[in-house]
């Protein structure tokens, strides 16, 4: 392009000019040959959506085995390929544990883990690299007022859903409360006055926010009333996505 | 940079070499100045996240006018060009359809569609490429208890807002429930006991989460009580943004 | 698992999370603000404390977030309200609670509601109550736009870093 530019501007160049043109042309060509691929690589490296292959968690596997974290090795359970291998992200869906507990499913239905994110019910969600993450959670609840009581309204119940972090560079100390939501429900008693259970009520407690996390920190959800969680499809989930 | 590089590697260059070096250096610099930005632009244009200008709602404008959405015209409503052409994103705001239905507006007020996202009330929101999307929805509801009834509280109503996907690679079969929120409201009857309508109640049912979507899949909202939707500004919306 | 309380834990207030240097990822404009717990009858947003921060151009001025560059942003906010039970002798009066994120822009002559939630709460007889409102969405914003909040029911806010917050990040 440089040669063409000079030719166009200066007309024919002869003698010593030819050598200069040759040098200029060769230099331009070499520069292009080097600059273009390097620029392509540089731009691709910097475009955040495109960060190359799957990044696996680089935490010390020995330490992991010692702690018995047993993080989920993503089986090829999902038919789809990981659509965005460069982006640490996770979406976990609520699953009932025995004994009225809240567990999380990482591979069924809409659930997934990408780019080195790991999950275990025992330890929570571990993010593979330092960064700014948008964390979110929604817990659906359901219940009925138990029988009895003279008032038309039953005893209130305050439902809380909270997101904590622990471990990693943050240290092994007290887990840190990151985000939480709450809702007080006052169930209606049996409207027919038959002293039976009241009608079913539903509510959802959700939230989301930015948190700066370090590699190896674990994020998990704690809730006040696991026995009232609604595990119907789409109702209860939590997740994280790296945004910076 | 070329000159410095040569100087550093080859020591001092004199006489005719200096001129050649000058030409080479200048050509190299000009070539870099032209090649690098052009390459950057070319690569950015080819990176799949970057698919060009604003795509407006593809719904039949005639049909829309028929529905008489009647949005408030803001001064200089949309002076902006598409601010980030490379990012598939959409924000749709609730609009009343005839017959107590919930429709969505894709271009007025704060609503927008970017980078090949398309919307029609009949088909929902179509995303232009495979990827990881954060989908969100908030539906505001309002109402009052109807007159009558001996109890101080009216009949409970459970409000649900649900996000589904259909079509695309997912197949033409049954739509798939992705995310859902619910809230049971038990309106208070006329406190003065005049058997009139109870006081207005308000609530919102919202959620958001990550979903891996494929190009051509459509996402849409379904709600339980379209007659109770609050269409005041900022109350009812849904959207999607590609995060990876 | 730790007990769930709506007050900041000692651990949380005693030690802040070390600030990150995100060498491996390009910083994007982002902000996460928390309600100032020392101001009980107003909602003042704070940055650079606890887990709150302003990053890559975001600034806080007159209790509003200033958008640093034009683009698409995800904007979110949450508040949590609480209150006491009413006395059995008193007539229960409904309480109106609302929280809104507003945009003030050179393009519009007024504050435009972006995110808005309302709730009528009827306090129960027996227990105190809690109610949270969270909302978030994507918006096309222009450099210099101001994002602010308006809240009804401020005396009922539960001001802690985990319950009352306001943020945005460029996509």
């Amino acid at each position: 392009m440089g040669a063409l530019g000079l030719e166009g501007r200066g007309g024919r160049l002869q003698g010593r000019g030819s050598l200069l043109l040759a040098v200029a042309g060769a230099t331009s060509l070499v520069t292009l040959l080097l600059a273009v691929p390097i620029t392509v690589l540089a731009v691709l490296a910097l475009v955040p959506q495109d960060q190359g292959g799957l990044v696996t968690d680089t935490a010390d596997p020995g330490a992991q085995a010692q702690q018995g974290l047993g993080f989920q090795k993503l089986p090829e359970e999902e038919p789809e390929a990981d659509l965005s291998p460069g982006l640490p992200a996770a979406h976990l869906i609520g699953a009932p544990l025995k004994g009225q507990g809240l567990g999380w499913e990482a591979t069924k239905e809409q659930a997934f883990l990408t780019s080195g994110t790991q999950f275990s019910d025992a330890e929570g969600l571990a993010l593979p690299q330092d960064g700014l993450y948008y964390l979110y959670c929604l817990v659906g609840y359901r219940g009925r007022a138990p029988p009895g009581g003279a008032e038309p309204r039953g005893r209130s119940v305050t439902l809380r859903s909270s997101l904590y972090r622990a471990g990693g560079a943050y240290g092994p100390g007290t887990p840190e409360l990151l985000l939480e939501g709450a809702e007080t429900v006052t169930p209606v008693l049996d409207p027919a006055g038959r002293q039976g259970y009241g009608p079913l009520w539903y509510t959802s407690v959700g939230f989301g926010g930015l948190v700066q996390l370090r590699r190896g920190e674990r994020v998990y959800v704690n809730i006040s009333h696991p026995d009232m969680v609604d595990f119907a499809r789409g109702k209860t989930f939590f997740g994280a996505v790296m945004v910076g | 940079m070329g000159a410095l590089g040569l100087e550093g590697r080859g020591g001092r260059l004199q006489g005719r070499g200096s001129l050649l070096l000058a030409v080479a250096g200048a050509t190299s610099l000009v070539t870099l100045l032209l090649a690098v930005p052009i390459t950057v632009l070319a690569v950015l244009a080819l990176v799949p996240q970057d698919q060009g200008g604003l795509v407006t709602d593809t719904a039949d404008p005639g049909a829309q006018a028929q529905q008489g959405l009647g949005f408030q015209k803001l001064p200089e409503e949309e002076p902006e060009a598409d601010l980030s052409p490379g990012l598939p994103a959409a924000h749709l705001i609730g609009a009343p359809l005839k017959g107590q239905g919930l429709g969505w507006e894709a271009t007025k007020e704060q609503a927008f569609l970017t980078s090949g996202t398309q919307f029609s009330d009949a088909e929902g929101l179509a995303l232009p490429q495979d990827g990881l999307y954060y989908l969100y929805c908030l539906v505001g509801y309002r109402g009052r208890a109807p007159p009558g009834g001996a109890e101080p509280r009216g009949r409970s109503v459970t409000l649900r807002s649900s996000l589904y996907r259909a079509g695309g690679a997912y197949g033409p079969g049954t739509p798939e429930l992705l995310l859902e929120g619910a809230e049971t409201v038990t309106p208070v009857l006329d406190p003065a006991g005049r058997q009139g309508y109870g006081p207005l109640w308000y609530t919102s049912v919202g959620f958001g989460g990550l979903v891996q979507l494929r190009r051509g899949e459509r996402v849409y909202v379904n709600i339980s009580h379209p007659d109770m939707v609050d269409f005041a500004r900022g109350k009812t919306f849904f959207g999607a943004v590609m995060v990876g | 698992l730790p007990g769930v309380g709506l007050t900041p834990s000692a651990a949380q207030t005693a030690r802040q999370h070390p600030k990150m240097h995100l060498a491996h990822s390009t910083l994007k404009p982002a902000a996460h603000l928390i309600g100032d717990p020392s101001k009980q009858n107003s909602l003042l947003w704070r940055a650079n404390t606890d887990r709150a921060f302003l990053q890559d151009g975001f600034s806080l001025s007159n209790n509003s977030l200033l958008v640093p560059t034009s683009g698409i942003y995800f904007v979110y906010s949450q508040v949590v309200f609480s209150g006491k039970a009413y006395s059995p002798k008193a007539t229960p009066t409904p309480l109106y609670l609302a929280h809104e994120v507003q945009l003030f822009s050179s393009q519009y002559p007024f504050h435009v509601p972006l995110l808005s939630s309302q709730k009528m709460v009827y306090p129960g007889l027996q227990e105190p109550w809690l109610h949270s409102m969270y909302h978030g969405a994507a918006f096309q914003l222009t450099q210099g736009d101001q994002l602010s909040t308006h809240t009804d029911g401020i005396p009922h806010l539960v001001l802690s870093p985990s319950t009352v917050f306001f943020g945005a990040f460029a996509l």
Partner: antibody
Framework: DVQLQESGPGLVKPSQSLSLTCSVT?????????WNWIRQFPGNKLEGMGY???????NYNPSLKNRISITRDSSKNQFFLKLNSVTAEDSGTYYC???????????WGQGTSVTVSS | DIVLTQSPASLAVSLGQRATISCRAS??????????MHWYQQKPGQPPKLLIY???NLESGIPARFSGSGSRTDFTLTINPVETDDVATFYC?????????FGGGTKLEIK
Amino acid sequence: DVQLQESGPGLVKPSQSLSLTCSVTGYSITSGYYWNWIRQFPGNKLEGMGYISYDGSNNYNPSLKNRISITRDSSKNQFFLKLNSVTAEDSGTYYCARDAYSYGMDYWGQGTSVTVSS
Amino acid sequence: DIVLTQSPASLAVSLGQRATISCRASESVDNYGISFMHWYQQKPGQPPKLLIYRASNLESGIPARFSGSGSRTDFTLTINPVETDDVATFYCQQSNKDPYTFGGGTKLEIK
């Protein structure tokens, strides 16, 4: 992919103990889920015998309670069945399976045939 | 224990026709807003294979010819249209209460 494989003796004498091993690959048994033993009698009737949870807790079918023990070795990613005082009625095909909470038993071993006979 | 009663015990259906299998529980298997009822297909010499979870959700990789419905105590597995490959025994199973229990099975044959 997640795979389960049962192993153990195919023939056990009455009154002795039956010991079977389930080896799991592709997923850590301490990560999540419930790890079950199910048996199928010659007439094709299926019986859930019990499970060990990801956290190490157990649950056994009351009909077997005094005879059954399910344990695990996390380092080898294996879990085990021990059934004491076996009789001819304990003959059948023994399967190990992963119970994915409310998502059903999504992965099964191929099964191992056990005959109780002197 | 929750007893699951399957009917019919065997079923002969023509190719391309609909097969319907019923499962009745001795008590409700619903909890937390979902039904803890699952359906399996077992072919000779193979372990059972999960077809439907939570009463009506198709397991990944299972053809849409299989569908499930029902709640609380009454559940149905439907195969429509029946294909040659569907010859097998089908079992319902509940996981709402320990111990897990299975139905007695329904053997499907082609007419």
